[in-house]
């Protein structure tokens, strides 16, 4: 807290300028008008104030706006934003994407701070949903943002926003998050032609059901093994040998290297050995010829 003292004669600041860096903390408090500061916030960034001086300026704004700063001030906070606490930010009503970008720019290159996380949450809640422009902005600054949202929060992402998602934005997502995102991506990209559609949908396929994988197998997509290994095991198990062969195309040979790993391992156990032999890859572990295959899940449901 800065003590209240009268401003010395001739030191009253007519505007926010470089001369203020020579003011002591008590002089800034006494001689800078808070309303003037608010209207000339854009100038603060260009002046090399010390951290202690910035504390005084923040204190003046806090006194002027005890209920929270208006967006006209927030947009021009610049480095003063780093002085804000999450509690300060919870009082704000930020609606402009330009304001959000300006403040994210201040924090650029640093890990997401509690202040930034609070700002983003306030902004997204204020908008009601993660629209495409917001998602575009957030993933540009923080590629892992999407994967830190819960499946419930992701359910509020409109399909149109999926166009903003890049493959690297999904790198750290878990299967339940992809379960939510995949149907949205399918809807977003539904009007694209076969090969273009596959390029776009590929990163989301960890959430795809069996019927969609079967449909893809009819489209000559040549899925690579890395994508295949990320598919849901329960979605892969019902696929026939012929369907997997069509789905992978020339990449089918990669199954041999992955035969001990999920979902390939579990899929092999479900196939007839003579069907596996048709691939000519030496895959072992299928159901021996002549054995009867019982659907135990069906049997359990009946008993």
């Amino acid at each position: 807290e800065v003590e209240k003292t009268a401003c010395p004669s001739g030191k009253k600041a007519p505007e926010i300028d470089e001369s203020l860096i020579f003011y002591k903390k008590w002089e800034l408090e006494a001689c800078v008008d808070a309303a003037l500061l608010a209207t000339q916030m854009d100038r603060v960034n260009a002046i090399p104030f010390t951290y202690e001086q910035l504390d005084v300026l923040k204190h003046k704004l806090d006194e002027l706006y005890p209920q929270g700063y208006p967006e006209s001030v927030i947009q021009h906070l610049g480095y003063l934003f780093l002085k804000m606490s999450p509690e300060d930010i919870r009082k704000w009503n930020v609606t402009s994407l330009e304001t959000l970008k300006a403040l994210l720019e201040v924090n650029k290159g640093h890990e997401m701070s509690p202040q930034v996380a609070t700002l983003i949450d306030r902004f997204v809640k204020g908008r009601g949903q993660l629209d495409k422009d917001t998602l575009d902005t957030l993933t540009a600054f923080y590629p892992g943002y999407l994967c830190s949202l819960s499946p419930e929060e992701l359910s509020s992402v409109p399909p149109s926003s999926i166009w903003a998602v890049r493959p690297q934005d999904l790198d750290t997502c878990d299967p339940r998050q992809l379960d939510v995102l995949y149907p949205k991506a399918r809807l977003a990209f539904q009007n694209m032609n076969g090969s273009e559609y596959f390029v776009k949908i590929q990163s989301f396929l960890g959430g795809a059901p069996t019927e969609d994988l079967k449909a893809l197998s009819q489209q000559n997509v040549s899925m690579d093994l890395a994508t295949f290994m990320k598919l849901r095991t329960d979605a892969v198990l019902p696929l026939t040998v012929a369907e997997v062969q069509k789905l992978l195309g020339p990449h089918v040979e990669g199954l041999k290297a992955e035969e001990r790993h999920r979902p390939v391992r579990d899929w092999i156990l479900r196939q007839r050995q003579d069907d596996l032999d048709t691939l000519g890859l030496g895959l072992q572990g299928g159901i021996p010829n002549g054995y009867l295959v019982l659907d135990l899940s069906m049997q359990e449901a009946l008993s």
Epitope: P86, E111, M112, S113, P114, V116, A117, T118, I120, D121, Y142, P143, G144, Y145, C147, S148, L149, S150, P151, E152, E153, D171, T172, D174, Q177
Partner: nanobody
Framework: QLQLVESGGGLVQPGGSHRLSCAVS????????MRWYRQAPGKEREWLTS???????AYADSVKDRFTISLDNAKNMLYLQMNSLKPEDTAVYYC?????????WGQGTQVTVAS
């Protein structure tokens, strides 16, 4: 830089219960998805469960009714309660944090289920 340190690994009887802990080095994060994964010998890393900043959680089908994830914010600890353990649960267990948009991994702790 956030650090994760797992503990609680060891030998457990089949059918028994066990709890793993993961100490999180900072407490100031706001948005997160904390997860447990495991990796059995010669197998790929497998996702087990996640807990998110809105308090919700999600589970892989293989552990849905047996494992429970929880987070003690006051102690900065992530837990994995494992019940009805089977020999096929033998693996190195890793905690993972997607915290404020960055991903971090612990070094892992070995759990062996055998009589």
């Amino acid at each position: 830089q956030l650090q994760l340190v797992e503990s609680g690994g060891g030998l457990v009887q089949p059918g028994g219960s066990h709890r793993l802990s993961c100490a999180v080095s900072v407490s100031t994060f706001t948005r997160y998805a904390m997860r447990w994964y495991r990796q059995a010998p010669g197998k790929e890393r497998e996702w087990l469960t996640s807990i998110y900043s809105d308090g919700s959680s999600a589970y892989a089908d293989s552990v849905k009714d047996r494992f429970t994830i929880s987070l003690d914010n006051a102690k900065n600890m992530l837990y994995l309660q494992m019940n009805s353990l089977k020999p096929e649960d033998t693996a190195v267990y890793y905690c993972n944090a997607n915290v404020d948009s960055k991903a971090y991994w612990g070094q892992g702790t070995q759990v062996t289920v055998a009589s």
